[in-house]
């Protein structure tokens, strides 16, 4: 019996040789092979020179191979695509000489962190290049210059903090560019040219809104139903366009679409299209913590395959999904033209949903199954997932509050005692002066430890006469299964174990789509916040009121008419009202 | 012209083997991929195995392990060694020529009839 | 494995008539990187061995009159005899070439009205 599978398709001949615990290639493959599968073995290196004889050979798929090292010297001229996936590759070896043919190109999640500038020299028919999740930090000027059939560029989650001007230079046929969950803070001036690109993914970055984001801002403006957020198991051609989910990471996630350039100089190639009133902004000093159980296995559940720490990707955020129904078992479907990822994660929008649904996620892995989805639950039961409570991080967000006479409680119960029970908010009640709440700074590992200091970023805040404050108390006993609004006794944190988080009731700066994530991991801020330790600029912080209708209309409690005080989402004593997630 | 003659039919009890043949003339043997498909009495026709022009064989699940197809170019031969036969295996099985690498085929021999019976 | 479902499975016709035949597969035939279908047509006579008339969907093996013509793409087919001839009276198969296991239609028996 022959040591893999044999089949035709498309007038191929296919080898399956998949799992077969191979630490080297099989002696008896056929001479006229022409898809050659040899993922999920143990072959460690691999040479194009292995392959030489296979004259029909014209897919080749390697992932899970625990590949270390790629050579390519010796030529494939039939060979159209090449997987390379889920390895350990650190660097990419020039391909072009060795494989002139080459139409597909998956380098996803891999070690690689940097790309030489002829990486991709010779590769003049690659129509699909695959890098998503590596640690790639930058990207050599002209990387894709040899490249110029190119239809499909995914870069995402990486730790890309800029893009070289003229990337995209010549790229007359790209369709789809995937560049969520990397460490963005802008696009340079241009980067679009006269491309069409029918499809491109933004989110997850920390665009940085100022005057420099002017060209983007405009570019989005302009072309609003080219963005996506991405839903895992969705072919891109099914998703809605969501040009909201680009998001200011230093004004309170305002989508940058809206930002309103006040005061920027108006240049040729971004003009200030907009004409918005000034509004104030207020420093925000976020403090990160880091190392707690929560954090570590929340995490997990997005980087079962990748290949660095989660820690050391605060920002590399893979494809967002929806929480998991149960604890994960890291079985694999494969998602054409994008890698694999596990299939117990649904397509969701955590970073920046734009429904109103309730998490449903248990960040311990614990037997337990974590909470069904209510069908029709009300939007201020919202439970927070359960952490240990030594595991909570510590998260303390002062903001300058206009009017701080009597700013009003929340407290957001953290355990949810049976799946079916719904937590129960309390009537907020006066906090206590500002000074007395404990603001502990936490340092975060950063990527480079010995080269970045940490620092804090300075919070000028007028002195108020009572701050306001959510807190996050003990587990609640079992509650009805409506929600019921109780008279709670005053709440303060009292250790490092509950978050303390401090907002306030600013006034609306613009009125955006922003609806609650879909699940709250850590705390809500580390999860919008979840940036580069080092944070490059300081936050601004703004409160975005949701509109009325980018929220789930069963969810959302409707008013009758559109006054202030009638709907409740332009009433500002009711803000607090509603769950920490919410905003 | 293109010519598949078959031989080595005949009644067989379950659990039996029996060789098929087929002669081929007309034509370059080694350059083509050659195939053997059978049809039951009364019903439709069922592939039951391939080879390819540099002798790699492949088959479907209903008779794999049980069936091998081999090739003699120097004879311009193709073979089937069936083991193992059930009385589902009964048919006339032919044999034919796919063009090129496609998997269609364009010339068929008359077929030589398999009867496994007790 | 992919599934070839005929229909009909017998139709009576008569000489001059015109015939469609269809062939419905599980998944799609289409090969995109060539825009190919990659489906195939055979006639098979009482006795006697199949005979290749269409195959790539639509593409006549030579030597087959030009009343034989097949179109569709996907996952349905369509066979079409546009004047029926005596000779035409015959089972036809359809085959999928796209992946092994090559799997054929059932048939669909001509008859004479």
């Known amino acids: 019996q022959p040591t893999c599978d044999v089949s035709k398709v498309t007038s191929l001949l296919e080898v399956n040789c998949e799992d077969k615990k191979l630490k080297k290639l099989p002696t008896d493959l056929p001479a006229d092979t022409g898809i050659l599968h040899l993922s999920k073995n143990q072959l460690g290196t691999f040479s194009t020179s292995y392959l030489v004889h296979f004259t029909h050979l014209t897919h080749l798929y390697l992932s899970r191979c625990e590949l270390t090292s790629l050579q390519a010297h010796e030529k494939l001229l039939k060979l159209e695509t090449l997987d390379l996936s889920h390895n350990h590759l650190q660097s990419l070896p020039s391909l072009g000489r060795a494989l002139p043919a080459l139409t597909t190109l998956d380098v996803s999640f891999n070690k690689l962190g940097s790309l030489s500038p002829g990486a991709l020299e010779g590769l003049g028919q690659l129509e699909e290049l695959y890098l998503q999740n590596n640690d790639l930090k930058s990207l050599p000027p002209g990387l894709l210059m040899p490249t110029t059939k190119l239809l499909k560029l995914s870069l995402a989650n990486n730790k890309l903090r800029e893009l070289p001007p003229g990337l995209l230079d010549g790229l007359e046929d790209l369709d789809t560019l995937y560049l969520q969950g990397n460490w963005l803070s802008t696009i340079p001036k241009g980067f679009f040219g006269s491309l069409l690109l029918p499809f491109v993914f933004l989110h997850a970055n920390t665009w940085y809104c100022d005057c420099e984001i002017l060209y983007f801002r405009n570019w989005l403006q302009e072309n609003p139903n080219r963005v996506y957020l991405w839903k895992e198991g969705v072919d891109v051609k099914a998703m809605t366009a969501n040009v909201a989910s680009v998001r200011c990471a230093n004004l309170g996630n305002a989508p940058v679409y809206s930002y309103p350039g006040k005061g920027c100089p108006t240049n040729e190639g971004d003009i200030d299209y907009d004409d918005y009133a000034d509004t104030p902004t207020t420093r925000t000093e976020v403090k990160f913590s880091t190392n707690t159980k929560a954090h570590t296995t929340y995490w997990g559940l997005f980087y079962s395959e990748s290949s660095t720490s989660p820690d050391s990707q605060m920002t590399s955020l893979p494809p967002i999904h929806e929480p998991t129904k149960k604890q994960p078992t890291f079985a694999h479907t494969e998602i054409p033209g994008f890698t694999t990822l596990p299939d117990t994660m649904e397509s969701n929008t955590a970073f920046y949903s734009l429904n109103n649904t309730v998490p449903t996620t248990t960040p311990e892995p614990t037997s337990t199954q974590a909470t069904p989805e209510p069908s029709s639950t009300p939007m201020l039961t919202t439970p927070v997932p359960t952490p240990e409570p030594s595991s909570i991080p510590m998260l303390t967000v002062p903001v300058s509050t206009p009017e701080p006479s009597s700013t009003p409680m929340l407290t957001t119960p953290v355990s949810t005692p049976e799946p079916s029970s719904i937590p129960m908010p309390t009537i907020p009640v006066p906090t206590p002066e500002p000074s007395s709440i404990p603001m502990p700074t936490i340092p975060v590992p950063t990527p480079e430890p010995s080269s970045t200091p940490m620092p804090t970023i300075p919070v000028p805040t007028p002195e108020p006469s009572s701050t306001p404050m959510f807190t996050t108390p003990v587990p609640t006993p079992e509650p009805s299964s409506t929600p019921m609004l109780t008279t709670p006794t005053l709440t303060t944190p009292e250790s490092s174990s509950t978050p303390s988080i401090l907002v306030s009731t600013i006034p609306p700066v613009l009125t955006t789509t922003l609806a609650p994530p879909e699940s709250i991991p850590k705390t809500v801020l580390e999860q919008f916040y979840t940036l580069e330790p080092t944070l490059p600029r300081t936050l601004e912080s703004t409160i975005i009121i949701p509109e009325q209708n980018s929220l789930n209309s069963q969810a959302v409690p409707q008013a009758s008419s559109d006054t202030p005080k009638s709907n409740p989402f332009l009433n500002s004593d009711f803000c607090c009202l509603l769950p920490l997630g919410f905003y | 012209q293109v010519q598949l003659v078959e031989s080595g039919g005949g009644l067989v009890k379950p659990g039996g083997s029996l060789r098929l043949s087929c002669a081929a003339s007309g034509f370059t043997f080694s350059s083509f991929a050659m195939s053997w498909i059978r049809q039951a009495p009364g019903k439709g026709l069922e592939w039951v195995s391939s080879?390819?022009?540099?002798?790699?064989?492949y088959y479907p699940d209903s008779v794999l392990g049980r069936f091998t197809i081999s090739r003699d170019n120097a004879k311009n031969s193709l073979y089937l060694q069936m083991n193992s036969l059930r009385a589902e295996d009964t048919a006339v099985y032919y044999c034919?020529?796919?063009?090129?690498?496609?998997?269609?085929?364009?010339?068929w021999g008359q077929g030589t009839l398999v009867t496994v019976s007790s | 494995d992919i599934q070839m479902t005929q229909s009909p499975s017998s139709l009576s016709a008569s000489v001059g008539d015109r015939v469609t035949i269809t062939c419905k597969s599980s998944q799609s035939l289409l090969n995109s990187r060539n825009q190919k279908n990659y489906l195939a047509w055979y006639q098979q006579k009482p006795g006697k061995a199949p005979k290749l008339l269409i195959y790539f969907t639509s593409t006549r093996e030579s030597g087959v009159p030009s009343r034989f013509s097949g179109s569709g793409s996907g996952t349905d087919f369509t066979l079409t005899i546009s004047s029926l001839q005596p000779e035409d009276f015959a089972t036809y198969y359809c085959?999928?070439?796209?992946?092994?296991?090559?799997?054929f239609g059932q048939g669909t028996k001509v008859e004479i009205k």
């Open positions: 085959q999928q070439h796209y992946s092994s296991p090559w799997t």
């Open positions: 080879i390819t022009s540099a002798g790699t064989p």
């Open positions: 034919a020529r796919s063009r090129g690498y496609e998997d269609y085929f364009d010339y």
